[in-house]
């Protein structure tokens, strides 16, 4: 867990922070950066996927988009599902901030969330036959 | 609405209990659109190491193991949130930063036909 937290010399300009916690500015750097979604790779892929949005008002960001593979197998040149190949999810960890209510007090916790980004077509290693 | 600045616990909670983040570690080789992983390291960021995918081929690997240029390998990109030390070098003061990473590659039918 806490890689890179303690080996820095603390400059005089660093803000004072209570023990066991850290100061986090949630004004996002590069907020307006956008992924080009116009290429429709999710529907053109041989392992196509759909998107579902999960929403949680106590999470920042409140919206997290998850990809969902459409098929067990992969789409062949004829547009048919080939079950001898496998569609599999590609996943990436990201950070979110969780707001926790304990009685009248509110605390904040960083969380690692695993997001499914898309799908890829792989040769199987598991053969579901007898 | 979240306040602009919050104090958060130093321990980062892991919600990934159902699945293993390292699970797809061999997909880069088994995919029909294989990729190489490149290490991106930045001590001013948490996590300090992020792996970037680079598609190995323009085309996709066919059933014979050859590159088929009638199909395209393309990167799957995702915006993720990381922590950036702010001010720089401070051990316990961060700002959220959005970065674009290539996570892997997928094989797609082309929309641009690069033919003579």
């Amino acid at each position: 867990g806490s890689e890179g937290e303690t080996f820095f010399q603390k400059p005089e300009s660093c803000p004072p922070v209570p023990g066991g916690s850290m100061k986090l500015d949630i004004g996002i750097i590069n907020e307006n950066q956008r992924v080009s979604m116009s290429r429709n790779i999710e529907s053109r892929s041989t392992s196509p996927w759909d998107y579902t949005v999960t929403w949680d008002p106590n999470r920042y960001p409140s919206e997290v988009v998850q990809a969902q593979c459409r098929n067990l197998g992969c789409i062949n040149a004829q547009g048919k599902e080939d079950i001898s190949m496998n569609s599999v999810p590609i996943q990436q960890e990201t950070l979110v901030v969780r707001r926790k209510h304990q009685g009248s007090s509110v605390s904040f916790q960083l969380e690692k969330v695993l997001v499914t980004v898309g799908c890829t077509c792989v040769t199987p290693v598991i053969h579901h036959v007898q | 609405n979240f306040p602009r600045t919050v104090m958060v616990n130093l321990n980062i909670h892991n919600r990934n209990t159902n699945t293993n983040p390292k699970r797809s570690s061999d997909y880069y080789d088994r995919s029909t659109s294989p990729w190489n992983l490149h290490r991106n390291e930045d001590p001013e960021r948490y996590p300090s190491v992020i792996w970037e995918a680079k598609c190995r081929h323009l085309g996709c690997i066919n059933a014979d193991g050859n590159v088929d240029y009638h199909m395209n390998s393309v990167p799957i990109q995702q915006e993720i949130l990381v922590l950036r030390r702010e001010p720089p070098h401070c051990p316990n003061s961060f700002r959220l930063e959005k970065i674009l990473v290539s996570v892997g590659c997928t094989c797609v039918t082309p929309i641009v036909h690069h033919v003579a």
């Epitope: 990809a67 969902q68 459409r70 599999v88 999810p89 | 699945t19």
Partner: nanobody, 123 residues
Framework: QVQLVESGGGLVQAGGSLRLSCAAS????????MGWFRQAPGKEREFVAA????????KYTDSVKDRFTMSRDYAKKQVYLEMNSLKPEDTAVYYC????????????????WGQGTQVTVSS
């Protein structure tokens, strides 16, 4: 946390039919495949069938092909296993589960299991 409730098992004569149901809750937004598995006394749990939530595409183990049919109701988050021409060797406890990596999911990667539903086929 994923919760799985299987039902529909029972005692049936060889050649008979049963329809199993599975209700799944707590699935992640990226869940895309569900499977049926079975475990006979003294044997390891084995894969029976899988279905894609979105496309409805299916995969069966060879011994049940043309006899078993898996279907799903995406809105209700339920899957079903229609079992026809049952044989004594189909006797087992049947389980359903989310397949987080589809057909690539290994048996040791399933975190949660339901209680299962007993299917007994008498000769």
């Amino acid at each position: 946390q994923v919760q799985l409730v299987e039902s529909g098992g029972g005692l049936v004569q060889a050649g008979g039919s049963l329809r199993l149901s599975c209700a799944a809750s707590g699935l992640t937004g990226s869940s895309y495949a569900m499977g049926w598995f079975r475990q006979a006394p003294g044997k390891e749990r084995e894969f029976v069938a899988a279905i894609s939530w979105i496309s409805g595409g299916t995969k069966y183990t060879d011994s049940v092909k043309d006899r078993f049919t898996m279907s799903r109701d995406y809105a209700k988050k339920q899957v079903y296993l229609e079992m026809n021409s049952l044989k004594p060797e189909d006797t087992a406890v049947y389980y359903c589960n989310d397949m987080p990596y589809g057909l690539d999911t290994r048996m040791d990667e399933y975190v949660y299991w339901g209680q299962g539903t007993q299917v007994t086929v008498s000769s």
